[in-house]
């Protein structure tokens, strides 16, 4: 469960994959589409507010039934709007939602590298965002040697 | 309880080796990175090395890149220090630490071994 | 590297003051910021991480603040107990890197 319905901070960062092309956000009929792409030389990076909330997770292995925390984080590029984990089309879509939030708005962190993050669906473990044909779309991790594969793997920046 | 059980120190001679080990218990080690950090007598605390969840990423500070070698088995939830070339400068306690999250960098270091002396001198 | 300038290095202080450490970034980051505190011949304890956030346990006169490159550790009211070395770690960019440390002596 999540602790509190507060995030424990909030980061505002601009969202590229491993090799360096960004994830921008474009308003197209009333709804948001999400592309992955190069930019220009001094093309503006789009921001996504990344907010951070602990979670606890349920062990078998210590006395207190708790065996440690997990950071959860929700992803918005704009006001209102979150990305989603859609797992039947296994796809990322941008939503309009309230708060709380649903489950399918929520990604257990991860660092696979000092300066890389991944995203894993909080409704869907083993699954993460990952690239696939120039868009995010959720992408099943079958092992923990392919955690290191590129197309799951994301950088923040603050500039 | 968490419990991180630190071993292998020693006094070594300048260019030796050793190699540390840090016992890990009551926590599901494959899921957190783990991190030595250092400490040389009656200074500062410094990093020294750190390994990603799954073995596969290792980091460290220029001190000791090339020298130093950070690693882990899962299977036998321990983590290990090989220590190369050894210097002088590398006397210090050596701590075992353990991250705040699962699969993640974030939030310091909330458990620390004993801590084991490692002292270089001819 | 980012440079953790902790201040000061040394204070003096009685039971009950309320006690200020300072940790100075020579880059902004953000708050992936620690404290600890240290006894002679102990290991060190985490008492805040998340520039703010007080670690299961940690008496709550133990507070921290702080963003970008500034941050603070605030000791409320000061307590037998807390005589001790304090340190600041960032977490945020690689190399990590620790403050050179504060030590709280009885004055």
């Known amino acids: 469960s999540i602790t509190g319905i507060s995030p424990i901070t909030e980061y505002l960062a601009s969202l590229s994959t491993y090799n360096d092309q960004s994830i921008t956000f474009a308003l197209e009929d009333e709804s948001y589409e999400i592309y992955v792409e190069d930019l220009k030389k001094d093309e503006k990076k789009d921001k996504v507010l990344l907010s951070y909330y602990e979670s606890q997770h349920p062990s078998n292995e210590s006395g207190d039934g708790v065996d440690g925390k997990m950071l959860m984080v929700t992803l918005s590029p704009t006001k209102d709007f979150w990305l989603h984990a859609n797992n039947k089309e296994h796809s990322v879509e941008l939503h309009k939602c309230e708060k709380p939030l649903p489950d399918q708005a929520f990604f257990v962190l991860h660092n696979m590298h000092s300066n890389c993050v991944s995203f894993e669906c909080k409704t869907d473990p083993g699954v993460f965002i990952g690239v696939k044909d120039n868009h995010l779309a959720l992408i099943k991790v079958d092992s923990s040697e392919n955690l290191c594969t590129e197309n799951i793997l994301f950088k923040l920046s603050e500039t | 309880e968490v419990q991180l059980v630190e071993s292998g120190g020693g006094l070594v001679q300048p260019g030796g080796s050793l190699r540390l080990s840090c016992a890990a218990s009551?926590?599901?080690?494959?899921?957190?990175?783990m991190t030595w950090v250092r400490q040389a007598p009656g200074k500062g605390l410094e990093w020294v090395a750190s390994i990603t969840y799954t073995g596969g990423g290792t980091y460290y500070p220029d001190s000791v890149k090339g020298r130093f070698t950070i690693s882990r088995d899962n299977a036998k939830n321990s983590l290990y220090l090989q220590m190369n070339s050894l210097r002088a400068e590398d006397t210090a306690v050596y701590y075992c630490?353990?991250?705040?999250?699962?699969?993640?960098?974030?939030?310091?270091?909330?458990?620390w071994g004993q801590g084991t002396l490692v002292t270089v001198s001819s | 590297d980012i440079q953790m300038t902790q201040s000061p290095s040394s204070l003096s202080a009685s039971v009950g003051d309320r006690v200020t450490i300072t940790c100075l970034a020579s880059?902004?980051?953000?708050?992936?910021l620690a404290w600890y505190q240290q006894k002679p011949g102990k290991s060190p304890k985490l008492l805040i991480y998340?520039?703010?956030r007080l670690q299961d346990g940690v008496p709550s006169r133990f507070s921290g603040s702080g963003s970008g490159t500034d941050f603070t550790l605030t000791i409320s009211s000061l307590q037998p107990e807390d005589f001790a070395t304090y340190f600041c770690q960032q977490g945020s960019k690689y190399p990590l890197t620790f403050g050179g440390g504060t030590k709280v002596e009885i004055k």
């Open positions: 880059e902004g980051f953000s708050n992936d």
């Open positions: 998340a520039a703010s």
């Open positions: 009551g926590f599901t080690f494959n899921n957190y990175w």
């Open positions: 630490t353990r991250a705040n999250y699962y699969y993640n960098t974030y939030g310091g270091f909330p458990y």
